[in-house]
Amino acid sequence: QLSRAGRSAPLAAGCPDRCEPARCPPQPEHCEGGRARDACGCCEVCGAPEGAACGLQEGPCGEGLQCVVPFGVPASATVRRRAQAGLCVCASSEPVCGSDANTYANLCQLRAASRRSERLHRPPVIVLQRGACGQGQEDPNSLRHKYNFIADVVEKIAPAVVHIELFRKLPFSKREVPVASGSGFIVSEDGLIVTNAHVVTNKHRVKVELKNGATYEAKIKDVDEKADIALIKIDHQGKLPVLLLGRSSELRPGEFVVAIGSPFSLQNTVTTGIVSTTQRGGKELGLRNSDMDYIQTDAIINYGNSGGPLVNLDGEVIGINTLKVTAGISFAIPSDKIKKFLTESHDRQAKGKAITKKKYIGIRMMSLTSSKAKELKDRHRDFPDVISGAYIIEVIPDTPAEAGGLKENDVIISINGQSVVSANDVSDVIKRESTLNMVVRRGNEDIMITVIPEEIDP
């Protein structure tokens, strides 16, 4: 229960002494104007969208909007008493560029577009940068032009810099041990994180730790091996701090930059320097299969801040810290390349969502544990001598599994050279691979079986 003293809004008539969440009315899954607190500050309700009436009986404005009466005065308890209605107006008035490559008049419009997108089961639209897409922006009052306070920049961006740890499984015991770590930075309030592709190479479990110490399992959403950029996602309730992307095309040699990373839990590493060259070719650097241009800097980039952001003095990301060639020379992937990747990733996911098919082989299975194996062995004398794997309960007729020769009571012990410990392992490989070369224990024989999953509509 919330104490009334914890509310900052002036109390509307008829508000309870204490908030009781159980009494809050149920809310629709989607709100056009986003969510807001009711007049009493007790319940989450659907807020009015931008341009809609507010105050009086109309209820509160949605997230990021404020109720303004015609003369431009924010609606207060006094205004409400004068019985004047207001309009919901965005608190932020500057244009922003979205990951769908559209320019929005303000942050509220982008958020509304993002809500619509999610309602259609498409990826959310995230803020790539302040200002219109593809438009230059020079602000003579910005920190970058007036000051050189590295610590201010760090303080501003550090909450959005994350520590990433990769775990591998030991081949037989399947125990997980850490193999590598790096950094990344949050680009959307709902948990999209950008890092280097080499930080999150395949077949690893990825764990993300925020500055406050909270840890999350991350899913790899998209990877561009050639550009060495990866997009990963954590599921987090509430809003996360984000970093906006600056324009690397506007960088000037000699400009101050800060490289930040999170090599250990709850700690950041910060190095600073200047931009040495804005476009060094990857081939020039001896990087295999790279025709990309890099930002060269003397800010030290090492394993600890690799994957983290290289920022300008406005705290805008102008690159991803990526590699150190020799002492005093480091390189970063330009933010314009990151923008392109995020926009293409958004498109890929939007298209992919529409045509996603499910892969299917036609078995019912369960994970085999030593106790389950013992129970089955007691029941069937010829049950295989295994204590882990995926036990096939049923093979559905006229399916790829039946065509491949799988039988009831088989135990799948490996697929495509990777050992199988549980039914989950099989499900994961089915999603990923187009041909499954299985080693199956049948009785006390190991049998090779090939199954080709078929694609079906979900």
Partner: antibody, heavy 123, light 105 residues
Framework: QVQLVQSGAEVKKPGASVKVSCKAS????????MHWVRQAPGQRLEWMGA????????AYNQKFKGRVTITADKSASTAYMELSSLRSEDTAVYYC????????????????WGQGTLVTVSS | DIQMTQSPSSLSASVGDRVTITCSVS?????MYWYQQKPGKAPKLLIY???NLASGVPSRFSGSGSGTDFTFTISSLQPEDIATYYC????????FGQGTKLEIK
Amino acid sequence: QVQLVQSGAEVKKPGASVKVSCKASGYTFTDYEMHWVRQAPGQRLEWMGAIDPETGGTAYNQKFKGRVTITADKSASTAYMELSSLRSEDTAVYYCTREGYSYEGGGYYFDYWGQGTLVTVSS
Amino acid sequence: DIQMTQSPSSLSASVGDRVTITCSVSSSVSYMYWYQQKPGKAPKLLIYDTSNLASGVPSRFSGSGSGTDFTFTISSLQPEDIATYYCQQWASYPTFGQGTKLEIK
């Protein structure tokens, strides 16, 4: 640097048991599985089994099941392989080898090996 | 079990020759590994994940292949390459090829 040092050669009679030790240094002993591979004269290498030193969990080649026991002492960073009911065909060089791991591809292999322990089974 | 067939079982070549060893498996595997073993010594890893050179291994050694057929190559044979070479896969558990004994003519 990583080193695996095995115990010395043994001569055993048929039916007896042998226990070979493998002392590891230069890495975190509990972060990798330790495997045992043997090589009979003129034969291919043959995997016998493995242990996760942290948990003591083991995996064995079916061929040796019931005859081989692999153990580990975390505090001493040492792994042991005991083979019982010895027969003349168990005459071989026995190697301990650390499971290696490919960060790029996620594949497993054997990256460091002990010097080998010759076990001779003869009446 | 996955059967591994390595060929040839022995071969003789001259210094500077290109030497090729093949390894076939009875069922498709993701990766192949190659080891060198000199008399009285433990095996030494040369190639991992089919084609990646292990640390400190000269670039004259290389590996290729996929699925069921894999190849190991020495581009220019050196006297110190005299040894037995083994392929190894790791599906449900590790198995090795029977070895190829390489001699200098």
